[in-house]
């Protein structure tokens, strides 16, 4: 039975040209995390594998940095980066947990962080 929950940074905003950290945290489970995938819609941004370490997808390696922790840093943001981001935790024996973050990239300096929320 899957007992874990994923806490994410929720709905967040950031300025064009700036950077943002996407963070998820898996709690309430003793399952072993074997790999975390970071995806934007159906595009893979990066993975962090327990054995193999980090690997950034070729098309994002100039603008994506691993960490902190299992999080992901997006740099040189453009308005095209606005959208949904998913952290997908592959765990054993539980299976897959998915967290969602919505990022809005703003032209002006009114970027503010939204509230955290949980996805069971």
């Amino acid at each position: 039975m899957m007992t874990g929950t994923i806490e994410t940074t929720g709905n967040i905003s950031a300025e064009k040209g700036g950077s943002i950290i996407l963070q998820c945290h898996l709690s309430s489970t003793t399952a072993q995390v074997t790999q975390v995938n970071w995806e934007q819609q159906d595009q893979l941004l990066a993975i962090c594998n327990a054995d193999l370490g980090w690997h950034i997808s070729p098309s994002f390696k100039d603008r994506v940095a691993p960490g902190p922790g299992l999080g992901l840093t997006l740099q040189s943001l453009t308005v095209n980066d606005t959208g949904e981001y998913f952290c997908i935790y592959h765990t054993y024996p539980d299976g897959t947990y998915t967290g969602r973050i919505f990022l809005e990239v703003l032209e002006s300096s009114v970027a503010e962080h939204g509230a955290r929320f949980q996805i069971p």
């Epitope: 072993q32 995806e39 370490g53 070729p58 592959h90 299976g95």
Partner: antibody
Framework: EVQLQQSGPELVKPGASVKMSCKAS????????MDWVKQSRGASFEWIGR????????SYNQKFKGKATLTVDKSSSTAYMELNSLTSEDSAVYYC????????????WGAGTTVTVSS | QIVLTQSPAIMSASPGEKVTMTCSAS?????MHWYQQKSGTSPKRWIY???KLASGVPTRFSGSGSGTSYSLTISSMEAEDAASYFC?????????FGAGTKLELK
Amino acid sequence: EVQLQQSGPELVKPGASVKMSCKASGFTFTDYFMDWVKQSRGASFEWIGRLNPNNGRTSYNQKFKGKATLTVDKSSSTAYMELNSLTSEDSAVYYCARGDLGRWYFDVWGAGTTVTVSS
Amino acid sequence: QIVLTQSPAIMSASPGEKVTMTCSASSSVSYMHWYQQKSGTSPKRWIYDTSKLASGVPTRFSGSGSGTSYSLTISSMEAEDAASYFCQQWSSNSLTFGAGTKLELK
């Protein structure tokens, strides 16, 4: 053209070791993972392990821990697999394959290296 | 580790016939991938992420499924489709293949 060029067939004696190579060309070697897969005669496939060429870190199928060792030479875009303490059970075709990062499938395969263990 | 059972093990089809082969997983998996292999050659990625066709694969092929049940379908069999087809999955602690379905031309 994206290619994985594997070393030639090997005939080895029981108890010996063998090291085979897989040279990548036509793509940036460090942008992908490299995997090794065993196909026994007339049988299906067994995944042996995966290598991250950026840092040399590896992930193995539990069954092949202690049997296979995966290494890399980034400068020549070449992955290697060494098999030790060979027995007749190790006679097979061994493929290197380019591994997808997230979904763990194999989009490019080498031609395979045939290993025959016989006294 | 997750066991993949392919059925049938061997099948034959006439040109123009619809072909369906299945891959059953012992536990739920998120994605299934399929490879085509012809005798004496290395496998080719055929269908990935359950339903996406690899580059160069004819559109008569399709893949579907979810959970523990997946399938590969050929809408109209052609001679060049005679080959062995293997399913493959990765879950958190294992990467496994099915034993294959050998498709012959009738």
